[in-house]
Interface confidence: low
Amino acid sequence: KLTIESTPFNVAEGKEVLLLVHNLPQHLFGYSWYKGERVDGNRQIIGYVIGTQQATPGPAYSGREIIYPNASLLIQNIIQNDTGFYTLHVIKSDLVNEEATGQFRVYPELPKPSISSNNSKPVEDKDAVAFTCEPETQDATYLWWVNNQSLPVSPRLQLSNGNRTLTLFNVTRNDTASYKCETQNPVSARRSDSVILNVLYGPDAPTISPLNTSYRSGENLNLSCHAASNPPAQYSWFVNGTFQQSTQELFIPNITVNNSGSYTCQAHNSDTGLNRTTVTTITVYAEPPKPFITSNNSNPVEDEDAVALTCEPEIQNTTYLWWVNNQSLPVSPRLQLSNDNRTLTLLSVTRNDVGPYECGIQNELSVDHSDPVILNVLYGPDDPTISPSYTYYRPGVNLSLSCHAASNPPAQYSWLIDGNIQQHTQELFISNITEKNSGLYTCQANNSASGHSRTTVKTITVSAELPKPSISSNNSKPVEDKDAVAFTCEPEAQNTTYLWWVNGQSLPVSPRLQLSNGNRTLTLFNVTRNDARAYVCGIQNSVSANRSDPVTLDVLYGPDTPIISPPDSSYLSGANLNLSCHSASNPSPQYSWRINGIPQQHTQVLFIAKITPNNNGTYACFVSNLATGRNNSIVKSITVSASGTSPGLSAGA
């Protein structure tokens, strides 16, 4: 069947369209094209006769049409009026007529649209704005974009006039956005430039910053006002109702109490004609004086004197605060505050109470601190210490002893040998000593301020022969798997080698054994019962050697899990039950028994004569070592059968 296809169907003005013929019969007389849906001579465009190969224009020919041998018609430079139906009249060679109709639509190439507005400066919550997409174009579809997004769903947005008009009712500042319209038809789509909606709003209630309303005399007052507004607000400041200046910021240097009052910021929007005000009340406080501390005793004596520290000056209705060592006051029965907190009393001062102490006066804005005060606590002297700790020296060496005692003011020192005063120095030096220098060396420390003296006596032995050493221990009764023990070989002597033996053997290699302090100290970590052996230390130098008496380590251990004997668990009625309990323990444990959970007796042996089946049950032995603080127990079930009922039963003891 003869058909016409329009390529394209939708044609842009100025372009061309091909009316393409399908299924054209083979043998033709000719054909003719007409404008419209029927053959009408008045509307003939062109005719073509095969035989003459002659194309004849008709009344509707415009000069823009070209006819092809296959009967297709090309129309160039399309105009709007070309829209519509076209009919091909084919005369076959047998002069049979055939018609086919095709059509196309012509659309203008759309111009770039623009947006017109009925209100260029709408006022928030008051005005509506109608955007219209220009120009008005037939057969065009209108679309709208807000910030390059399609229109949001909103009851305040309304499309009308075939979507050509977008109305925003009761505009808000949030409607300030980029608006674009787009026109579309089947042959083109064009977007307008964006139009920014300038919504006038505000001023909102202004905010005054900073928020603080309390100031100190002498500070600068710098207030800034801001109100959301379009166009930006014009600002004015009033102080106590008096107009000050028309600026966004109000600056008053070096304020005084007289600057206290109500500060009003007025924001004005010249376009909306609206004014809004915010009031803040500023309070200026007089600067309090810097506090200082007075003391009733500048040189208190430790453990004797009390000290009262007072925060000056005295100001009515003021909160006083105290700090010791930059921290708030610790809770202590020796620290007392007066009712108004202005006086801090230290009862029975100690050397640790030196401070520093600070007091503070709290006002509405801040806390003013005093300068720190340090107490000069007089103390000591404590018992002096003499160093080095050696008590044994070889002849010919130099003896240099130093004495020190904690004291404030620093102690004055004196040395005595065998009760005879030697010199008033902190150090005592004797060169090239002999056996005659052996004796009692006393250091006396004196505190001139407190009048107190303390002494320490040290026995010095000068001998070529080493003395017999002895072993001191830091723990005479260590607990197994818990304690460590440190043995120290005494005395400490110069140029001396220290040696150790365990059960007459040199020290075994063990990670639990450690020598230190020039081998003078032997430490046993995590002692075990196997460490309960004889320990001997020895000292030797190039002249002599000597060994200590043995010290046996008493390791506390246990109680281990007890054993109940005999092991029998079945007895004949009438036999005697004689159970003995034993547990390895040092010291020996305390024993107790329970039968079927009921306490019996605190003995190692449990004896029951002539048992019966009533004596059936669980027999528990409990062991307790008071020294180690450990407990242990074991349970044994005993069955008593009637006489002669069961062979192999024990007759008992």
Partner: antibody, heavy 121, light 106 residues
Framework: EVQLLESGGGLVQPGGSLRLSCAAS????????MGWVRQAPGKGLEWVSS????????SYADSVKGRFTISRDNSKNTLYLQMNSLRAEDTAVYYC??????????????WGQGTLVTVSS | DIQMTQSPSSLSASVGDRVTITCRAS??????LNWYQQKPGKAPKLLIY???SLQSGVPSRFSGSGSGTDFTLTISSLQPEDFATYYC????????FGQGTKLEIK
């Protein structure tokens, strides 16, 4: 019709005092800001002082601060300027003027005819 | 304080001339500027407020413009009654005036 009528000017010795008055009519005086502006002979205008609708809000030019006091009596529709410790440089015509409530901030929209103050020994 | 400087200090012109007087503030005053006219022996009269708004009853030949620091008073066609001294005034605090511009007949 707005009218402002100043009085109280005259000749005064340096260090002396004078009190100017301004009688207002034709508008709601009690709700209007008022001010004084002076003009020395052959010179330009100089703002002197202003007062709010309530007497609590006052402001002064630095040149008169501490010597002049502006006040008002709303019941009498009258504005005053108490001038103490007068100096030769205070010699001027003193105008009373009104600040309207709008526009914002307000200009001086109505002025009196002025009163001459002469400070001379 | 904000200083206001007018220029010129004096100006000679003829009836029908277009005249411009400028006023410069020492710092930005937004649009808070007023213009006044004063004739000898008379009180000043408000012409323009808020830099560009014409006071009621003032002929439309007077116009004002500017914002920030630079402002202008323009008389589009001088009339005989316009010869006077013109003052600008900033409406901040204190309310300082310019030194004045005397407009005389040429």
């Amino acid at each position: 019709e707005v009218q402002l009528l100043e009085s109280g000017g005259g000749l005064v010795q340096p260090g002396g005092s004078l009190r100017l008055s301004c009688a207002a009519s034709g508008f709601t005086f009690s709700s209007s800001y008022m001010g004084w502006v002076r003009q020395a002979p052959g010179k330009g205008l100089e703002w002197v002082s202003s007062i709010g609708s309530g007497s609590y809000s006052t402001s002064y030019a630095d040149s008169v601060k501490g010597r002049f006091t502006i006040s008002r009596d709303n019941s009498k529709n009258t504005l005053y300027l108490q001038m103490n410790s007068l100096r030769a440089e205070d010699t001027a015509v003193y105008y009373c003027a009104r600040y309207p409530s709008v526009p914002f901030p307000p200009p001086l929209d109505y002025w009196g005819q002025g009163t001459l103050v002469t400070v001379s020994s | 304080d904000i200083q206001m400087t007018q220029s010129p200090s004096s100006l000679s012109a003829s009836v029908g001339d277009r005249v411009t007087i400028t006023c410069r503030a020492s710092q930005s005053i937004s649009s808070y500027l007023n213009w006044y006219q004063q004739k000898p022996g008379k009180a000043p009269k408000l012409l323009i407020y808020a830099a560009s708004s014409l006071q009621s009853g003032v002929p439309s030949r007077f116009s004002g413009s500017g914002s920030g620091t630079d402002f202008t008073l323009t008389i589009s066609s001088l009339q005989p009654e316009d010869f006077a001294t013109y003052y600008c005034q900033q409406a901040g605090n204190p309310h300082t005036f310019g030194q004045g511009t005397k407009l005389e007949i040429k």
